[in-house]
Each structure stands twice: as C-alpha cells, then as structure tokens.
C-alpha cells in the first residue's frame, strides 16, 4: 500500500560536507517498526545511501560506517547526511517502509535536491 | 552507460508458455519504469505490459490480459515478462524498453521510454 512522504526540495551542505533534512510521512496507522532509506539518483542509477530500521519512540541505528545519523520524532524522521563532496551533489530521496504491524506500506518522497560545494583551500600563509 | 538486454524468446506450440527475462548491463534496473512492447511482422510496434519503479503498478494490454505477468527480480537486477496460455498472434520480436523517472513517478508508468533492448523473437506454431 503507498504512503505520503514529504522532504524538502532543496538542501545546501554546510562547508563541511554536512546536510540534514526532515522526512515526514503521513502513518495510516500505529506503525510501530519503521524502515527508513534514502536513496540517491544520478546519472539514470538509483543507489542506496544508508537505511535503518527503528522501533516507534527509539533512535534511528545506521551502520558503524554509514554516512547517515538520524533521530525520529512522531512521523518525522531528522536525517543527516556526512562527509558529503561536490561529486556527491544529486537528488536524495527518502523512503519509508511500516514495517510492523500488517499491513505494509511504502511510501517515496519527492527527493531533495543537494547540492554540496568543495571548499577552497586555504591559501597558504607566509 | 545502461543497456537492456532482453532473453528467454524461442518457438512454443498454442497453449504454451514462455519466460521473458530483461536485464541490465552497465547498471542497475532499480526503480526505473519498465515496459515491454512487441512487433508482429508487418504490424506497428505495441506495449503488451510495464511495472513501474516501485513495482506496486502494472499495466496490460487487453489481448495479453489475464495470459502475461510482469514481476520485477531485483535479486537478479531483472525484470520477468511470464507469457502463459500462448497464441499465433503473440507471435512477434518483443522487446524491453526503460526509463528512470523522477521519484514522484516511481508508481507511474513511463509513458515515453529513453532504452531500448534489441529485442527477443517469439514465435507461437505448431
């Protein structure tokens, strides 16, 4: 069954290749296991970034070595993505799936557009 | 660079069946728009079926209704077109066609696609 999911459209990473947005998706009923993904699309290739399955009132728990922290509150999800370059800039789509109880649903945002800029180098001082 | 590669055409009596297989080389099928047309000799190219990204929508033409599945393998980064119940008139070159739309259409249909496989010769006698 499909869900609603909203994030923002467009988001800048900060100078130290940090992004953060919300995800927010519209529960039609009392999910109490949540699986969230997010998913990048580039040059006509969907990859996955990072995912976490979370119980309802718990902390999101990526990978050791995954780029993406996260907290959760009600029906938003606070993503944050790390160590993000220029190369990296893409469309960033959040999915969400209720895992638990029955029924499933998906539910697929719009993406978000990040855009991320490379620092200059620090010229050097004499 | 995405190219479709399409197998599993050949001759089968009226009443059989037959396994159509759609897979990528150079990348992923992941959430792209899936289509299947075919081409009777002297006849206009037409869509028998699509699944969208999501794979939560199907489409088929009404003379493959209720005779052909589509289902997507992402374990085998394929797409399936089981053709059951077969008649002379299926008989054609069948061909995989895709499209990777934006997410807000991962549950659509393509209606126009950007990849085309070269194509798999079906042929329905007896």
């Known amino acids: 069954k499909a869900m609603h999911v909203a994030q923002p459209a467009v988001v800048l990473a900060n100078s130290r290749g940090t992004a953060s947005f919300v995800c927010e998706y519209a529960s039609p009923g009392k999910a109490t296991e949540v699986r969230v993904t997010v998913l990048r699309q580039a040059d006509s290739q969907v990859t996955e970034v990072c995912a976490a399955t979370y119980m309802m009132g718990n902390e999101l728990t990526f990978l050791d070595d995954s780029i993406c922290t996260g907290t959760s509150s009600g029906n938003q999800v606070n993503l944050t993505i790390q160590g993000l370059r220029a190369m990296d800039t893409g469309l960033y789509i959040c999915k969400v799936e209720l895992m638990y109880p029955p029924p499933y649903y998906m539910g697929i945002g719009n993406g978000t557009q990040i855009y991320v800029i490379d620092p200059e180098p620090c010229p050097d001082s004499d | 660079q995405v190219q479709l590669v399409e197998s599993g055409g050949g001759l089968v009596q009226p009443g059989g069946s037959l396994r159509l297989s759609c897979e990528a080389s150079?990348?992923?099928?992941?959430?792209?728009?899936i289509g299947w047309f075919r081409q009777a000799p002297g006849k206009e190219r037409e869509e028998v079926s699509c699944?969208?990204?999501?794979?939560?929508?199907?489409n088929y033409a009404d003379s493959v209704k209720g005779r052909f599945t589509v289902s997507r393998d992402n374990s085998r980064n394929s797409v399936i077109l089981q053709m059951n119940s077969l008649k002379p008139e299926d008989t054609g070159v069948y061909y995989c066609?895709?499209?990777?739309?934006?997410?807000?259409?991962?549950?659509?249909?393509?209606?126009?696609?950007?990849?085309w496989g070269q194509g798999t010769q079906v042929t329905v006698s007896s």
């Open positions: 066609t895709g499209k990777l739309l934006h997410p807000s259409l991962w549950s659509a249909c393509a209606n126009e696609y950007d990849l």
């Open positions: 699944i969208s990204g999501t794979g939560l929508r199907t």
């Open positions: 150079g990348g992923t099928l992941d959430y792209w728009s």
